[in-house]
């Protein structure tokens, strides 16, 4: 069945509670405009956003009789002539009278009528009917022939983008049929279609159509309200292409519409062949969008990539939610032109700070007050990690100057990264020098502290992302951060007394629940002795606290328990709820507190491994003290099992060095020189491409590395956890259904195969990755079972 | 055809002002803006503003901004510059030119000569 | 002062071809279009060449733009008589937020 038989059905189905053969129709209020009613229009009981009113009229080919309730009469049926009175084309049948067309049309043959309704006719210029009228055996003929085809067409044969010979010349009738049922020829809506006749059928329409003979490009060398649009596709190469055969759909902007236009802006733009294609591109569909089949808002790809979404209110045509459109459907042979009155500049044509919208005003004025502006260079790359105006408060608004700038420097980087470009454990450079890592998650994509929220774009020289929160950089380890704060002096002394301090030293990538000493509140000292003399319980207990990967409380999908392993081998379970972080069920007291190897969560109380049972009486008396979320297991004789530590000591990257180095004797105040030789660095690493594993190898190609002193100045190079980059699908911000994720040994950031599909903009769905073709990172350990 | 029309030449002690108009036809004048440039003797061009005759939004260069107003009049499809606070170096002859920002200047009025003196 | 910088002359025998620059910056043309003005003596300017290399209609193909970088050059092919005049370089300038003229290039037929 076609688009239009199934509306046409749905209304029979609204409507058969009036009897039989009842259509339920919708028309606009305020206007004459009715529709068959859609499912959505009829759940909505509005149409392009106006209210509509149901009428409930007899199906077409039906007919009421008196005394019964529907329709259960059909209608008669007769030659075209007498069908168009059938219709109520009246004004059509009398113009096919005089015109002499009536015995063509009473005759032999097999005709297709696209009959103008009456109102139509009323509508037509004024000056137009009385020259048809003028000269009725020539003009009217011709005009009523541009509107027949020689053989039968219901409408479930009038398919989408068909062209069909009219009995004039020959000449084009442009056929679409869209999903929402509405069928146009010419952009004239059938109204009523498929009136049989017994020679041929009938199709009313919403207007008259008028010949066409002329191009899109034809139209706008003679259109003189256009010379400035016309102008700019001739700059851009653009305007033979509009020439050529096709179905397009052109939103012309007029020349009021280019007046409104920034001078600055437009003379960027169009100094930039790239640019200015992208402008004019932008307001090309490569498919006949006509005005009446606009019922609710659709979003059309454009010529340039990117997508504008038309919709309407009323009898007008919105463009991206403004209200544009003066004057539609101007029908030529290879395609529809609309006039607007804005012009429509794409993202791709845009410098990157001109990306960011309503929310991220504040981070873009202070980037102009600050002088910030000035360094993104119209020829050069940037990314501008823009943080939503909500994020910035008031203490950081009042801060010195000199601070903020720096702040805002953390938050622009030295080249364009597309959404699509992310990967965990990326490194990203501010143009402030500062380094920035990437946290990639099932739903959400977070820079250090900050995750993002939807509306990436990306303009002509850079890339913009939204962020919830400020990004801060990371200055101290996990080990430091704990030191300078008093609330974990016990937690810390409880870590060097287990030897565990190197681990939170050295860099890595880690999520430590820390316990403030509240946690401990009540242990004696002598208690705290016995806690410190099994060391193997004491490891067992703080490594519970530790886990591989960097996990944002931020990052977590809302509502989702995260099952993670922890350092020392039981799971452990995180959910974010209400913006607070629940670890075991306990609500986190600080989260998302960043560190150069790892992110803290603060918990006042002690966690303890559920599975692990213990098997000393005063220990248990000790722990059942500290821990009251859950019962601990107590099994006589039970030991804790000592954990190898060398699983977790970072892997370093070996340099080779050819030859010893070359020391020279110096007198005083000059500087020490060391030249090292070395081979270049073979860095391999898996990128999920498309949703299938690439294995990359990227060779460092490492240069002579002068030291010199007396101010030495050293790099130190070490491989982080596995990387895996993964070029991710959707970017999801809804909350989906609360499922329990179940996420075990690694670094953690690993994406179920279905989930690729959900994570990023654009609905392009992954590939299924095979579980065998997963290739891990160089620090990987293995995965245990994984289930959804 | 297009053609814009310039008033006549004009002579104005230093401080006083002076105002320029220039007829448009041949167009849709709304459809369009307008730029004034000005010519000293024996040197080159240089840009005073523009005005946008859709909507009467304008542009005027940084140098005269606060000497400088522009307005038009739909209704007679006349573009108006006016130069207030006249000094001996605003002598110069003034031309207004369409402006359609894609294709800029692409027809010129004949041109007002503006002389200043004491 | 003209932001944009033209040689003051250039001149050739009939038929020949001539090129006159235009030098800017990054502010103007190096991220602005550039548009050329033929003044004949004693009359307006003309427009000559819009957006880089774009002749309106009605002036010949003799006249051709280009721009790469921050710098411009309008070339005159088949030098004639009637060529002789001033030519003007212009661009929009970002920092200044103004439409900016060159210093004009007087071209004479030998």
């Known amino acids: 069945n076609s688009y239009y038989d199934k509306v046409l059905a749905h209304s029979r189905i609204r409507g058969r509670d009036q009897g039989p053969n009842v259509c339920a129709l919708q028309q606009i209020l305020g206007t004459k405009k009715k529709y068959f009613s859609s499912c959505k229009n009829w759940y909505q009981g509005a149409i392009c956003g106006k209210k509509t009113t149901v009428l409930y009229e007899c199906c077409p080919g039906y007919m009421r009789m008196e005394g019964m309730k529907g329709c259960p009469a059909v209608m008669p049926i007769d030659h075209v002539y007498g069908t168009l009175g059938i219709v109520g084309a009246t004004t059509t049948q009398h113009y096919s009278d005089v015109s002499k067309l009536r015995e063509e049309i009473e005759g032999k043959g097999s005709y297709t009528y696209f009959a103008p309704s009456n109102e139509a006719w009323e509508n037509l210029d004024s000056d137009i009917r009385r020259g048809l009228e003028n000269n009725v055996n020539v003009e009217l003929l011709n005009a009523l022939h541009s509107h027949m085809v020689n053989k039968r067409m219901l409408t479930k044969d009038l398919k989408h983008g068909m062209v069909i010979p009219s009995m004039y010349n020959n000449l084009g009738l442009f056929i679409n049929h869209y999903p929402n049922g509405v069928v146009t020829v010419n952009c004239a809506r059938v109204i009523h279609g498929n009136q049989i006749a017994t020679n041929g059928v009938v199709h009313v329409i919403d207007r008259v159509l008028t010949q066409i003979g002329t191009s899109i490009q034809d139209f706008l060398e003679a259109e003189d309200d256009l010379s400035s649009f016309r102008a700019a596709a001739i700059t851009s190469d653009l305007l033979e292409s509009l020439g050529r055969d096709g179905h397009f759909t052109l939103f012309a902007p007029t020349n009021e519409a280019f007046e409104k236009l920034p001078r600055g802006v437009l003379e960027r733009i169009m100094g930039d062949k790239v640019a200015s294609e992208a402008l004019m591109k932008y307001h090309i569909l490569n498919t006949l969008q006509c005005s009446e089949a606009i019922t609710g808002g659709a979003v059309f790809e454009t010529m340039e990539g990117n997508t504008i979404e038309i919709g309407c209110e009323g009898d007008s045509i919105s463009i991206n939610g403004i209200k544009m459109v003066n004057k539609k459907d101007i029908v030529t042979k290879n395609g529809v032109i609309h006039l607007i009155d804005e012009v429509l500049i794409p993202d791709s044509a845009k410098q990157v700070i001109e990306l960011a919208g309503k929310q991220q005003t504040t981070f873009t004025d202070l980037v102009a007050q600050l002088g910030l502006a000035s360094s993104l260079k119209p020829d050069g790359e940037y990314t501008l990690l823009a943080p939503v105006n909500n994020a910035f408060s008031d203490d950081t608004l009042s801060m010195d100057q000199r601070l903020l700038k720096l702040i805002l420097q953390n938050h622009i980087l030295k080249v364009k990264v597309g959404l699509s470009d992310l990967y965990n454990g990326q490194i990203l450079e501010t143009i402030g020098g500062k380094q920035l890592r990437v946290f990639v998650y099932r739903t959400a994509i977070c820079i250090e502290n900050s995750c993002m929220v939807r509306g990436s774009k990306q303009g002509r020289n850079g890339a913009i992302h939204i962020f919830r929160e400020i990004i801060q950089p990371a200055e101290k380890s996990l080990h430091d951060k704990l030191r300078q704060d008093k609330r974990f002096s016990i937690f810390l002394s409880l870590l060097e007394a287990a030897d565990l301090k190197d681990l939170l030293t050295q860099p890595g990538d880690w999520t430590l629940f820390a316990p403030t000493n509240d946690a401990f509140k009540g242990m004696t000292s002598e208690e705290r002795e016995l806690l410190i003399g099994d060391k193997n319980a004491l490891q067992n207990i703080i490594l519970y606290h530790l886990t591989p990967g960097v996990y944002i409380g931020k990052g977590f999908e809302p509502g989702v328990t995260n099952i993670l392993k922890t350092t020392q081998g039981s799971k452990i379970y995180l959910k974010g709820v209400n913006e607070t972080l629940l670890v075991n069920e306990l609500k986190s007291k600080e989260s998302d507190i960043m560190t150069t190897n790892g992110v803290i969560h603060v918990v006042d109380k002690l966690l303890y491994p559920a599975d692990i049972p213990v098997g000393n009486d005063q220990l248990l008396e000790l722990l059942n003290k500290l821990i009251k979320y859950i019962q601990i297991k107590f099994v006589r004789g039970s030991t804790f099992k000592e954990i190898p530590m060398t699983v977790y000591r970072p892997a370093m990257t070996k340099i080779q060095i050819e030859g010893d180095p070359d020391f020279r004797l110096i007198k005083e105040g000059e500087t020490v020189t060391e030249v090292i030789h070395g081979e270049p660095v073979i860095k391999k690493y898996t990128k999920i491409i498309d949703g299938v594993p690439v294995e990359i190898t990227e060779k460092q190609t490492r240069e002579e590395r002068i030291i010199t002193g007396p101010e030495i100045k050293y790099t130190r190079i070490s491989t982080g956890g596995g990387e895996t980059g993964e070029t991710l699908q959707k970017f999801l911000q809804k909350e989906v259904s609360k499922v329990t994720k179940f996420i075990e040994g690694g670094d953690g950031h690993l994406f179920e195969d279905e989930e690729i599909k959900r994570l990023l903009q654009g609905d392009t769905p992954a590939k299924k990755i095979p579980a065998n073709k997963r290739v891990q990172g160089p620090r990987r350990r293995s995965r245990e079972g994984r289930s959804q | 055809q297009v053609q814009l029309v310039q008033s006549g030449a004009e002579v104005k002690k230093p401080g006083a002002s002076v105002k320029v108009s220039c007829k448009a036809s041949g167009y849709t004048f709304t459809s369009y803006g307008i730029s004034w440039v000005r010519q000293a003797p024996g040197q080159g061009l240089e840009w005073m503003g523009w005005i946008s005759a859709y909507d009467g939004n304008t542009n005027y260069a940084q140098k005269l901004q606060g000497r400088v107003t522009m307005t038009t009049d739909t209704s007679t499809s006349t573009a108006y510059m006016e130069l207030r606070s006249l000094r001996s170096d605003d002598t110069a002859v003034y031309y207004c030119?369409?402006?359609?920002?894609?294709?800029?200047?692409?027809?010129w009025g004949q041109g007002t000569l503006v002389t200043v003196s004491s | 002062q003209s932001v944009l910088t033209q040689s003051s002359s250039a001149s050739g025998t009939p038929g020949q071809t001539v090129t006159v620059s235009c030098s800017g910056s990054?502010?103007?043309?190096?991220?602005?279009?550039v548009n050329w003005y033929q003044q004949l003596p004693g009359t307006a300017p003309k427009l000559l060449i819009y957006?880089?290399?774009q002749r309106p209609s009605g002036v010949p193909d003799r006249f051709s733009g280009s721009k790469s970088g921050t710098s411009a050059s309008l070339a005159i092919s088949g030098l004639q008589s009637a060529d002789e005049a001033d030519y003007y370089c212009?661009?929009?300038?970002?920092?200044?937020?103004?439409?900016?003229f060159g210093s004009g290039t007087k071209v004479t037929v030998l």
């Open positions: 990054s502010s103007d043309i190096g991220s602005n279009r």
């Open positions: 030119a369409r402006d359609m920002l894609v294709v800029p200047f692409d027809y």
């Open positions: 957006s880089n290399d």
């Open positions: 212009a661009a929009w300038d970002d920092s200044l937020s103004t439409y900016v």
